[in-house]
C-alpha cells in the first residue's frame, strides 16, 4: 500500500553559475500542526533516465504545508547534458532503517539547459568558473553540427576528452594549477572552421590563514590590529579576500578596509578583556584566527615629547620630557640613552607617570651630546614606544691641558731665529673653541724683560727673532672662558747640535723603531723630531713627546714613502726645560735601488789612463744608503786587469767591473790602457737593494804615446 505522505509538486530550478540543481517540493496529507521525521530518496540521471549518476537520502523533519528544499552541485556543467530528477519518501524510523516503507517514485523531472543556448555553432562550458588550485574541473563543449571534428585546448595544448553524445564531449582536468592572474584559457575550435570558442577558468591560490595576528593600543581609544595576510590569491576577476574582525564580549563586528590591518574603537565603558576573531574570506573559503587579551597588557605607548634640557653646565644637564596620557595613570618605564660621538655612553631607566626627569652627569665641557628616550608599560611590558631624540651641548670651560709645543732654532747673521710650533688641543682638552694662543718670551738674564705675543687660532706656528741669550718661552691656549696651563721651553743661541754622530736605522712598514741611551741626571722627558716631507722646503716638522723613563719608541706616519731618507733627532729635556740633542738617526722606511747615476767628469787622459770624478754626487738624496760604486769599462780587447772582474751586461755585452767600497770615494783612475784605443765607461752607485741603471756608456779614445798631455 503506498505511503500517504508522498512528495508532490516537485519543481527543479537551475543555477548555471554554481552548476546547481535546486529542488522544491511539498508533502500533502500532513495535518497543519503535525511534525514528522521523514527521509527522501533523490535520484539524478544524466542524458537518459536509466543512467543514474546520483542517489542520496535526505532526512528532515516535515511540518504541515511546508515547502522543502534540496540542492545538488554537478561536477559537469548543466549545459553539457540533460538531467532527470525524481524522488520518493519514507517515514524516518531510525531504529529499523532497513524496513522502511517507501512511497511511489515521483515522475521524472527533466532539466535541459541546451534548449536555451541559442543558435551558435559551438559552446564551451563552464563560463568564468572560479576554483581553487588543486581542484578537479569538468569542461564540455556543445556543438550544433555533427559533421565537424572539434578539438579543445588547455593553454594551447590539446586535451583528450570523452564523448557524452554526438554533440557533446567532456574533459576532466585534475589538480588544476594557478597559471596567471587573468585565468587559465581553455578553447575549442572546429577543424577547418573559422571560429574559436574560449572560456576562462579562474584558478585561485588557496586562501591562507592570517599569520601573526596581533592587536595593541597607543591611546586607549583605538585598538590597532595587524596580521600577515600571506600570499595573494592571485586573481583579478574576483574581489580579493576580505577580512572581518569580530569581538565576542561586545558582540561587535567590523569589515576591515585593508588587507593587513584594521582599527577597532575601544569601548568607552572600559572593557578590559577582548576576544577577537579575524576571518579571512573569499568566494571559495573562510579562514579564522583568534586572540584573547587584556587591553592593559597591549599598550604600545606613543613616543615621548617635549624633550628639553635645563640647567646645562660644564659637566651636567637635566633632561625633562612628557609622555602621552595612557588612561588610569599607568606607570611607564622610560629608557634614556646618552650618545657621545655616535656611541651610547650612558643608559638609564626612569619610572614616569606624566613628566620624566633625569640628571645626566659626568659630561665633558663644550661637547655636543644626543639623548633619546622611549617608554613602555612598566607593569605589563608589551612594546617600546619610538625613540624621541634631542641634542644639547655642555658649557665651555677653560682649556685643561697645555699645548704640545716644539721649536726649530736657526742661527742667522748672529741672531737666533726660533720657529715655535704647537699642536691644536683635542676637543676634550680645549673645552671650547680656541680663540688665540699667548706667547710670553722671558729673558732669563733679565727676568723683567717680557715680550707678549698673541697669535689668533687656528695658526699653529710663529717665528721669533732673538739674540744669542737664553730665553724661556711660555705658550698658552685661550678660549672664551679662560687660559690653559702653560707649555714652557728654553731656547739659547747655541743648541750645540752638530757634535752628535748620526746612526743608521732600518725602517719597516710599521715605521721606525728608535732607541737611545738613558740620560743620567734630572730629565723631564724626551722629544723625537723628524720631517714628514724632508724633500719639501717646508719639511712638515713633526715631534713626539716621551716620558723620562722611556728609551725607545716606534715612529710611524702615513706620510712615510719608500725611497725617502728620514732624519730623526732625539732630544732630552732638562728640568730647566732646556732641550739638548742626544742622538741622530737616519733611515728609509724601504730602500729602493738607486734611480740615477752620478754625473761623471773625465780628466787626465793619457795613452795609458784617465781619471773619473763625481764630486757633486749627493749620497743623502738617494733612495737607499749608497755603499759604493761600480766602474764598468768596455774595450775591444776585452782583457780585464787585476783589480777588475769580467761582467756580462743585460745586453750580453762583456766588460770589466771595478768595485769601490767607500761611498765617500768619488774619484777613480782607470789605468793599464793601450794607446790609441777605444774605450767606454759607466759609473753606477750600488746599495743593499741594487745598483743604478745600466744606461748609456761614455766613449773615450786614448791618445798615442807621444801626444802632449
Amino acid at each position: 500500500e503506498p505511503l500517504p505522505w508522498a512528495p508532490e509538486s516537485l519543481k527543479v530550478s537551475i543555477n548555471s553559475t554554481h552548476q546547481c540543481l535546486h529542488l522544491q517540493w511539498s508533502v500533502h496529507n500532513l495535518a497543519y500542526h503535525q511534525e514528522l521525521k521523514m527521509v527522501f530518496q533523490i535520484e539524478i540521471s544524466r542524458i537518459k533516465t536509466s543512467n543514474v549518476i546520483w542517489v542520496e537520502n535526505y532526512s528532515t523533519t516535515v511540518k504541515g504545508n511546508q515547502l522543502l528544499h534540496w540542492s545538488w552541485e554537478s561536477q559537469l556543467p548543466l549545459e553539457c547534458a540533460k538531467h532527470f530528477i525524481r524522488m520518493r519518501s519514507a517515514v524516518d524510523d531510525a531504529t529499523t532503517p532497513e524496513q522502511r516503507f517507501w512511497s511511489n517514485w515521483s515522475s521524472w523531472e527533466e532539466v535541459d539547459v541546451q534548449n536555451s543556448l541559442g543558435h551558435e555553432p559551438l559552446f564551451v562550458f563552464p563560463k568564468d568558473k572560479l576554483v581553487e588550485e588543486g581542484s578537479n574541473v569538468t569542461i564540455c563543449y556543445v556543438s550544433r553540427s555533427q559533421q565537424n571534428n572539434i578539438s579543445c585546448y588547455l593553454e594551447g595544448v590539446r586535451m583528450q576528452g570523452q564523448q557524452l553524445d554526438p554533440n557533446v564531449s567532456m574533459f576532466n582536468l585534475h589538480n588544476v594549477a594557478f597559471i596567471r592572474e587573468t585565468g587559465t584559457n581553455i578553447y575549442c575550435k572546429v577543424d577547418r572552421g573559422d571560429d574559436i570558442k574560449g572560456i576562462v577558468l579562474f584558478v585561485s591560490k588557496i586562501l591562507e590563514e592570517p599569520k601573526d595576528f596581533s592587536c595593541e593600543t597607543r591611546d586607549f581609544q583605538t585598538l590597532s590590529c595587524t596580521w600577515d595576510p600571506g600570499r595573494d590569491t592571485g586573481l583579478l576577476k574576483q574581489l580579493p579576500q576580505s577580512y572581518t574582525l569580530f569581538e565576542s564580549f561586545s558582540g561587535k563586528k567590523t569589515l576591515c578596509k585593508h588587507k593587513g590591518w584594521c582599527n577597532w574603537q575601544v569601548a568607552p565603558e572600559s572593557q578590559e578583556m577582548y576576544n577577537f576573531t579575524l576571518t579571512a574570506e573569499n568566494y571559495l573559503r573562510k579562514r579564522s584566527v583568534h586572540i584573547l587579551f587584556n587591553l592593559t597588557h597591549r599598550v604600545h605607548p606613543m613616543a615621548p615629547f617635549n624633550v628639553l634640557f635645563k640647567d646645562v653646565s660644564v659637566t651636567n644637564a637635566t633632561m625633562t620630557w612628557k609622555v602621552h596620557s595612557t588612561g588610569n595613570y599607568y606607570t611607564l618605564l622610560c629608557q634614556v640613552e646618552l650618545y657621545g660621538e655616535g656611541k651610547v655612553i650612558q643608559k638609564h631607566n626612569v619610572s614616569v607617570k606624566v613628566n620624566g626627569e633625569l640628571v645626566l652627569s659626568g659630561l665633558e665641557p663644550d661637547t655636543e651630546y644626543s639623548a633619546q628616550v622611549r617608554c613602555a608599560n612598566a607593569n605589563h611590558f608589551w612594546k617600546w614606544s619610538e625613540w624621541t631624540r634631542q641634542n644639547f651641548t655642555t658649557v665651555e670651560a677653560a682649556p685643561s691641558e697645555a699645548p704640545d709645543v716644539w721649536r726649530n732654532v736657526k742661527s742667522v747673521q748672529g741672531y737666533c731665529v726660533v720657529t715655535l710650533f704647537w699642536k691644536p688641543l683635542s676637543r676634550l682638552q680645549a673645552n671650547g673653541e680656541i680663540l688665540f694662543y699667548n706667547i710670553v718670551v722671558e729673558d732669563l738674564d733679565r727676568p723683567s724683560g717680557l715680550q707678549l705675543l698673541s697669535v689668533p687660532a687656528p695658526a699653529n706656528r710663529t717665528e721669533l727673532t732673538l739674540d744669542q741669550r737664553a730665553y724661556q718661552i711660555h705658550v698658552t691656549a685661550n678660549n672664551s672662558v679662560g687660559t690653559s696651563p702653560a707649555s714652557v721651553l728654553v731656547v739659547s743661541g747655541d743648541p750645540g747640535d752638530e757634535e752628535v754622530e748620526e746612526e743608521r736605522v732600518k725602517g719597516t712598514e710599521d715605521g721606525f723603531s728608535l732607541s737611545w741611551k738613558p740620560q743620567p741626571g734630572n730629565i723631564t722627558g724626551y722629544i723625537v723630531e723628524w720631517c714628514d716631507r724632508p724633500r719639501d722646503p717646508l719639511c712638515d716638522l713633526q715631534w713626539k713627546h716621551l716620558g723620562p723613563n722611556t728609551t725607545s719608541t716606534v715612529i710611524s706616519s702615513d706620510a712615510f714613502r719608500p725611497g725617502v731618507r728620514y732624519n730623526f733627532r732625539i732630544y732630552g729635556i732638562s728640568t730647566e726645560m732646556v732641550p739638548y740633542l742626544l742622538e741622530k738617526k737616519t733611515g728609509y722606511s724601504q730602500e729602493l735601488a738607486p734611480s740615477d747615476n752620478p754625473r761623471v767628469v773625465m780628466s787626465n787622459l793619457t795613452s795609458h789612463s784617465f781619471t773619473l770624478s763625481w764630486k757633486d754626487y749627493s749620497t743623502e738624496s738617494q733612495p737607499s744608503f749608497i755603499r759604493g760604486y761600480h766602474v764598468y769599462l768596455k774595450s775591444k780587447a776585452g782583457q780585464c786587469h787585476p783589480g777588475s772582474e769580467k761582467a756580462v751586461l743585460s745586453d750580453d755585452s762583456v766588460c770589466c767591473k771595478y768595485k769601490i767600497d767607500d761611498p765617500k770615494q768619488k774619484m777613480f783612475v782607470v789605468g793599464n790602457l793601450q794607446p790609441e784605443s777605444f774605450y767606454e765607461f759607466l759609473v753606477t752607485p750600488y746599495s743593499a737593494v741594487g745598483e743604478g741603471p745600466h744606461g748609456a756608456f761614455t766613449k773615450v779614445t786614448t791618445p798615442d804615446e807621444y801626444s802632449p798631455m
Epitope: 551558435e120 568564468d128 593553454e155 594551447g156 587573468t182 584559457n185 578553447y187
Partner: antibody, heavy 118, light 107 residues
Framework: DVKLVESGEGLVKPGGSLKLSCAAS????????MSWVRQTPEKRLEWVTY????????YYADTVKGRFTISRDNARNTLYLQMSSLKSEDTAMYYC???????????WGQGTLVTVSA | DIQMTQTTSSLSASLGDRVTISCRAS??????LNWYQQKPDGTVKLLIY???TLHSGVPSRFSGSGSGTDFSLTISNLEQEDIATYFC?????????FGGGTKLEIK
C-alpha cells in the same frame, strides 16, 4: 562574417573627454570578450583595456587606469570606450578587437583616430 | 611589464624566399605568444596564436615556433600579398604587450 566598426573619432584638447563606440555584427556578441588596442603615431601597438563577455570584469593598462572606462551593451551589440582627462600621449588609432582567448586579439576593426592636441 | 623585442625593424626579401622574423620576451611567457600582420592600409589580422597555432584562413606557408623567451615567425615561400608589418604579442601577463614590429619589404 565578423565585422567590427569603430566610431567616435575626433580632435580633443588635453583634459577633454571622448566616447568611442564599436558596432559588432556577424557573430554572437554576448559570447565574446572584447578589447581596445591603440596604435601610436610612431606605429607602436598598445593594449588599452579588456571586458569579459558578460561585462562583469575588466582590465586596464596602467597608463589609462582611472581615466578610461570600458563597457558593453550586449542587447545593442556595441562596445564602448569612455575616455576622460585625455593627454597628448593618448593620440592614436583606436581598434576594437574580439578576444576568443584572453589576451589574444583574433579580429580587429578598421580603427578610429583620436587626436589630443591644444 | 614584460618587454617584447623585435630586433629587426625592417627586412628586405625576394618573392619565393624563406623569411624568419624573431621576437624576444624579457621574461618567460611559456607558449603564450601571438603574431599579427598589419597591411599598409592599416588592417590588422591575427596570424598565429599560442606560438604555433595557425588562425583560421591563414595560409599554411606561415608557421611559428619557440618557447619561454625566444620565438619566431617563418614565411616559407614569400608572396607579394605578405608585404606588411608583423607584430608579436604576449598574452601571458597583464599588461598584454606588443613588439615594435618588423616591416617586410620586397628587394
Amino acid at each position: 562574417d565578423v565585422k567590427l566598426v569603430e566610431s567616435g573619432e575626433g580632435l580633443v584638447k588635453p583634459g577633454g573627454s571622448l566616447k568611442l563606440s564599436c558596432a559588432a555584427s556577424g557573430f554572437t556578441f554576448s559570447s565574446y570578450a572584447m578589447s581596445w588596442v591603440r596604435q601610436t603615431p610612431e606605429k607602436r601597438l598598445e593594449w588599452v583595456t579588456y571586458i569579459s563577455s558578460g561585462g562583469d570584469y575588466f582590465y586596464y593598462a596602467d597608463t589609462v587606469k582611472g581615466r578610461f572606462t570600458i563597457s558593453r551593451d550586449n542587447a545593442r551589440n556595441t562596445l564602448y570606450l569612455q575616455m576622460s582627462s585625455l593627454k597628448s600621449e593618448d593620440t592614436a588609432m583606436y581598434y576594437c578587437t574580439r578576444d576568443p582567448i584572453t589576451g589574444t586579439f583574433a579580429y580587429w576593426g578598421q580603427g578610429t583616430l583620436v587626436t589630443v592636441s591644444a | 611589464d614584460i618587454q617584447m623585442t623585435q630586433t629587426t625593424s625592417s627586412l628586405s626579401a625576394s618573392l619565393g624566399d624563406r623569411v624568419t622574423i624573431s621576437c624576444r620576451a624579457s621574461q618567460d611567457i611559456t607558449n603564450y605568444l601571438n603574431w599579427y600582420q598589419q597591411k599598409p592600409d592599416g588592417t590588422v589580422k591575427l596570424l598565429i596564436y599560442y606560438t604555433s597555432t595557425l588562425h583560421s584562413g591563414v595560409p599554411s606557408r606561415f608557421s611559428g615556433s619557440g618557447s619561454g623567451t625566444d620565438f619566431s615567425l617563418t614565411i616559407s615561400n614569400l608572396e607579394q600579398e605578405d608585404i606588411a608589418t608583423y607584430f608579436c604579442q604576449q598574452g601571458h601577463m597583464l599588461p598584454w604587450t606588443f613588439g615594435g614590429g618588423t616591416k617586410l619589404e620586397i628587394k
